[in-house]
């Protein structure tokens, strides 16, 4: 992209409540892909907070693309009553926190975490690697942030935001230091390379989120995770564009978004990413 394509969006306050995304891909911009078909599809627009129509070229693109308006709404919007703050002093847990742990049918035996509604705590379990349900977290911290109550009985979201008991407002807690880069791509791009269970030595690429580059690794031929691409180009296309450079908290964000400048605040963003 040329420098003219880059947009420097100033993040400023508006009347919009904080945006809560059910899936990280809902934040992706509409991507028509390189092909030339004319297919009516829908995407979630984080600026208008609505599902909107766009023309898809028929190949590639990204996950923010749905066959119908209903599917888009189901995946990316929440009922306003549940959106951010309950009238009580406690935010509502996502429904999937109340599902039982589910190992799925595969045989990967991966350590994951689930919220146990009996003990009200996040606990470890063995996940097979496929199917299962959304009460399935890669880290204990992620599980706690999304499903456990905070120390005062308040629901804490996965950006360390807690409902303030004094004025019912959302206040950022210092549980996470904002980093220079924030990732808004598929969650599997943040997982480590996983050789898998078999004995082959296939050349694959994985996205190294620490250095922000796609690197080769040897894949065993089965198992593993989705941070696994047959080419460097495919890896970059899937993962590289997920990064947004953050200059300062509430400051400048440099994006490569070809759209007119809009002033919007995406405050204390909650992204419930569950890639199964």
């Amino acid at each position: 992209d040329s420098e003219e394509d880059e947009e420097h969006t100033i993040i400023t306050d508006t009347e919009l409540p904080p945006l809560k995304l059910m899936h990280s891909f809902c934040a992706f911009k509409a991507d028509d892909g390189p092909c030339k078909a004319i297919m009516k599809r829908f995407f979630f627009n984080i600026f208008t907070r609505q599902c909107e129509e766009f023309i898809y070229g028929g190949c590639e693109g990204n996950q923010n693309r749905f066959e119908s308006l209903e599917e888009c709404k189901k995946m990316c919007t929440r009922d306003n009553a549940n959106r951010i703050i309950k009238t009580t002093l406690q935010q509502e847990k996502p429904d999937f926190c109340f599902l039982e742990e589910d190992p799925g049918i595969c045989r990967g035996y991966i350590t994951r975490y689930f919220y146990n509604n009996q003990t009200k705590q996040c606990e470890r379990f063995k996940y097979g690697g496929c199917l299962g349900n959304m009460n399935n977290f890669e880290t204990l911290e992620e599980c706690k942030n999304i499903c456990e109550d905070g120390p005062n009985g308040f629901q804490v979201d996965n950006y360390g935001t807690q409902l303030n008991a004094v004025n019912n407002s959302l206040t950022p807690q210092s549980t996470k230091v904002p980093s220079l880069f924030e990732f808004h791509g598929p969650s599997w791009c943040l997982t480590p390379a996983d050789r898998g269970l078999c004995r082959a030595n296939e050349n694959r690429f994985y996205y190294n989120s620490v250095i922000g580059k796609c690197r080769p690794f040897k894949y065993s031929g089965c198992g593993g995770n989705e941070n696994n691409f047959t080419s460097k180009q495919e890896c970059l296309r899937a993962c590289k564009k997920g990064f947004i450079q953050r200059i300062s908290k509430g400051g400048l964000i440099k994006t490569k978004r070809k759209r007119k400048k809009q002033r919007v605040k995406i405050a204390y963003e909650e992204i419930f990413v569950k890639n199964m």
Epitope: P103, C106, R107, C130, N228, A238
Partner: antibody
Framework: QVQLQQSGPGLVKPSQTLSLTCAIS??????????WGWIRQSPGRGLEWLGM?????????SYAVSVKSRITINPDTSKNQFSLQLNSVTPEDTAVYYC??????????????WGQGTLVTVSS | DIVLTQSPATLSLSPGERATLSCRAS???????LAWYQQKPGQAPRLLIY???TRATGVPARFNGSGSGTDFTLTISSLEPEDFAVYYC?????????FGQGTKVEIK
Amino acid sequence: QVQLQQSGPGLVKPSQTLSLTCAISGDSVSSNSAAWGWIRQSPGRGLEWLGMIYYRSKWYNSYAVSVKSRITINPDTSKNQFSLQLNSVTPEDTAVYYCARTMSKYGGPGMDVWGQGTLVTVSS
Amino acid sequence: DIVLTQSPATLSLSPGERATLSCRASQNIGSNYLAWYQQKPGQAPRLLIYGASTRATGVPARFNGSGSGTDFTLTISSLEPEDFAVYYCQQLNSIPVTFGQGTKVEIK
């Protein structure tokens, strides 16, 4: 050789319950490496996965959202079979119903054994 | 739900020709969780390929699966008379399990 034999009525009245059974031979419904499920096929809908059960030190089930409020899949370990119950049926539930085993092999999962299929018509 | 789109809807070929069937997923499903099935009229589907590229027991070597992420291909290197049927792809990555709408391979 694993085989699945389906049984159950081919005609169900609207608002009633569709009940089918799938008898397993050559494997166990309590197998630790398989899942047992139901799929239906109709001209309008194509192949539609309805749900499955599997045993991994305890029983688990997963159902399709489209039928979640109406469906029950149960194992019967004494007879080595599993059943499908679909409540409050309508003519839209008319389809060929298949039971199938999903095996998780080391290359990945797949439905490797299927029942013969039962055409269920919902009509008064 | 993960939507699987198969193309073309119909493929008209002669015995001995090569068939290339495509399956595109609406989300990344990795490389281990895609299966291909063959179905003939009046019969249940038959598993051909699992894990995107592994042939099921008894499936002839002319059937080959490839792909990962969102784009998958089933290739029949040289069509035999018994290969004319409908082919479905299926993802077993996440609930609900979903199928493509099918590609019919018919005799030209």
